[in-house]
Amino acid sequence: APRGTQAEESPFVGNPGNITGARGLTGTLRCQLQVQGEPPEVHWLRDGQILELADSTQTQVPLGEDEQDDWIVVSQLRITSLQLSDTGQYQCLVFLGHQTFVSQPGYVGLEGLPYFLEEPEDRTVAANTPFNLSCQAQGPPEPVDLLWLQDAVPLATAPGHGPQRSLHVPGLNKTSSFSCEAHNAKGVTTSRTATITVLPQQPRNLHLVSRQPTELEVAWTPGLSGIYPLTHCTLQAVLSDDGMGIQAGEPDPPEEPLTSQASVPPHQLRLGSLHPHTPYHIRVACTSSQGPSSWTHWLPVETPEGVPLGPPENISATRNGSQAFVHWQEPRAPLQGTLLGYRLAYQGQDTPEVLMDIGLRQEVTLELQGDGSVSNLTVCVAAYTAAGDGPWSLPVPLEAWRPGQAQPVHQLVKEPSTPAFSWPWW
């Protein structure tokens, strides 16, 4: 704020007074000054800042005939409807030559019924959970004493005797209303009524009960919900192998989640149609007639690996003397995990079955015992993952190879034992 210098005497012979009244009051602040020569423009300051749009009038009257004689200047600032924004310290400011002069200050304040600076706000709280409400009122006149009311019932014997600016509520079991009365010498003002809606507490102990490659069974412990029974719980699952990563407190999942509703009790749900061997994050919230609880933190879970759902494809087996050449292609059906390799079994009509682990190769040459006179030799192949073997192929008979003939190819016709995999939501 500009400061008057002491080098020359201040021209002010009258300073702004004080105005204190109720909202809506009209009043006038005045500054009076006596200057020699050309009268200056009088500016008004509020709390040190020039009021650019002040409703002010300036009257100036010469005290003599000569322009260089003294002038009396009166500046009047009108406050038409006193508001909180009008309150503060007022001063006049004039520039005379190279100097700035500021009048002594006057003050504008409010006096009347208490005025609320802060009122209780609507909010939701979990059942039986402590919270605070705020209420702040000012005069003048001071003091202002507060009285809190819950469901229109006073929480203290008299204003000022109970909690004041902050009301600590240890917990609620039903939706309630709170208001605050402000009392001063002029009377009473009542705040807005805040509705505090009691929601269920966040469920606890969300955990896995059982895991299947395409489904997870989860359970949780419900939180308290006050006098309002839980109507249902909602479980969300989202893929978390996209590299985005869900932080514990992240408000929203990166993708549209799979959402399922569970009737309660029991507080358990089977979540199906999932990808095998896939990381997910899951969370749960429970709802009463008053609304939903907050979500639990995201819990990382993973579906286990499954066995391949189908046998290898396009198996061909040809015999040339004491050697048999077998090759195949990867199963078309979902592997439900990481393919670790193939197992091959061959068997003659009257000979025991021979089982081999081929690894990840898709062909093998078999050295047959003896002169190759074993009759009706058949070959089966299965793919396997860490979870175990997938279904074996149908037995493929060993064909004798004739030069100039194309090797026979046996198409599998047997359907997989489980239904074809579908992705209804992915």
């Epitope: 005497e9 009258g14 007074g17 006038t28 009257t59 009396i72 009166v74």
Partner: antibody
Amino acid sequence: EVQLVQSGAEVKKPGATVKISCKVSGYSFWGATMNWIRQPPGKGLEWIGLIKPSNGGTSYNQKFKGRVTISADKSISTAYLQWSSLKASDTAMYYCAHGHYESYEAMDYWGQGTLVTVS
Amino acid sequence: DIQMTQSPSSLSASVGDRVTITCKASQDVVSAVAWYQQKPGQAPRLLIYWQDTRHTGVPSRFSGSGSGTEFTLTISSLQPDDFATYYCQEHFSPPLTFGQGTKVEIK
């Protein structure tokens, strides 16, 4: 509490000079102005002049200029009115009065008065 | 110099009466009018300044109004303590001038 205490009554001969004092307590002496007003017996109020103790600046009623001197001693928070060439018509109660913060020429606190009799 | 013409010079009234005293300035004094009450043997006492602002401790039955050159002091309900002489004064510019006074007497 603001108090203005004036010197005691004076009886003077015509042509003499009188100097009366006004001691201020209870507020900052050089904040506003000190006015001098007189009131002849049974008559109205008449402004004599003023002084701004902060800088010693004075303003006089032209009617009395030349016979009146207003001064102040900041160190003892006292204002003075000196009147020379007294006439019988100068017999009056003389008041000092403090200028109001919001308009130094409106007078919010008054001394008890000093009666000057010229005869 | 500004002249202040006060009327009436005296009036008789009873306790509880509404009393009005007027003062006319010879030129516009921009609301710079004060009113004083003086009782016998006492110094004047400031009642109103800047036309309508009550001085500290002055009862609310005293009010000032007016604009430009015509100003009024009103006592809404006369009390026994209010019988005195009342003066107006312009505090706009030196030389400061007072009205001749209005004596309020018991009827």
